[in-house]
């Protein structure tokens, strides 16, 4: 059926960058400026995306492909194809409806985007806190308290080197 249709349908010969023009006996007409067709055989072209305001043009629209946007400095992309730009915050902050707010005690954010996340609870893994957490950094968990008790170390210290000619005391 596909083969039959392509033999009968003159529009199937229209390449990307054109549309099949019903007003001109189905000849292939070039897409108007600021529009594109990324596949062949299209009856219309698509309007190019315009990167305005907080959006910045990453790739210009051509007759065969849409424009691609990213965000101006101080903002980052969200959504498929950068459909939204969201304000950056500093590390140690998260974006709320009232703007950037510092992370609450016990939480951190090490990026300019996203939300504050709770510090790791070292005790859940039977470990102790080696380095305290901050608004910008998670805690660093160390060995468990049991690992630190005298004589319980699993790491055997190296035997002291003996000097030649000295017998052990």
């Amino acid at each position: 059926f596909e083969r039959t249709r392509s033999l009968q349908d003159p529009c199937s010969n229209c390449p990307a960058g054109t549309f099949c023009d019903n007003n001109r006996n189905q000849i292939c007409s070039p897409c108007p400026p600021n529009s594109f067709s990324s596949a062949g055989g299209q009856r219309t072209c698509d309007i190019c995306r315009q990167c305005k305001g907080v959006f910045r043009t990453r790739k210009e629209c051509s007759s065969t492909s849409n424009a691609e946007c990213d965000c101006t400095p101080g903002f980052h992309c969200l959504g498929a194809g950068c459909s939204m730009c969201e304000q950056d915050c500093k590390q140690g902050q998260e974006l709320t409806k009232k703007g950037c707010k510092d992370c609450c005690f016990g939480t951190f954010n090490d990026q300019k985007r996203g939300i504050c996340r709770p510090w790791t609870n070292c005790s859940l893994d039977g470990k102790s806190v080696l380095v305290n957490g901050t608004k910008e950094r998670d805690v660093v968990c160390g060995p468990s308290p049991a690992d630190l008790s005298p004589g319980a170390s699993s790491v055997t210290p190296p035997a002291p080197a003996r000097e030649p000619g000295h017998s052990p005391q």
């Epitope: 001109r24 108007p32 219309t44 698509d46």
Partner: nanobody
């Protein structure tokens, strides 16, 4: 009914100038995206220039940048194309075109006139 009537074509020597006019009726030229397309002998249509978006931003094909100027007279509902430093490769039939935006989001264009022949030859 939308009508577009082109005029101003002719035979001109290389390096010469011409001004094409397109008198529009059935729509307001200042409220539409309009422009010029051309068809050289044995070739397909090519966009030459256009005035886009109500703000009046302009588009020019790379091959005519710096040589052609598009403008419109809203009072006369007329579109113009001032062509200078003409070259043999500018020889074509020039059509006035109106960009059509469809409800489904697609875009095409209309050329209702017969076009005006521009021949650049010595």
């Amino acid at each position: 009914e939308v009508q577009l009537l082109e005029s101003g074509g002719g035979l001109v020597q290389p390096g010469g100038s011409l001004r094409l006019s397109c008198a529009a009726s059935g729509f307001t030229i200042s409220a539409e995206d309009v422009g010029w397309v051309r068809q050289a002998p044995g070739k397909g249509l090519e966009w030459v220039s256009a005035i886009l978006d109500f703000g009046g931003s302009t588009y020019y094909a790379e091959s005519v940048k710096g040589r052609f100027t598009i403008s419109r007279d809203n009072a006369k509902n007329t579109l113009y194309l001032q062509m200078s430093s003409l070259r043999a490769e500018d020889t074509a039939v020039y059509y006035c075109a109106r960009v059509v935006y469809h409800a489904g989001g697609g875009v095409t264009f209309d050329t209702r006139g017969q076009g005006t022949q521009v021949t650049v030859s010595s």
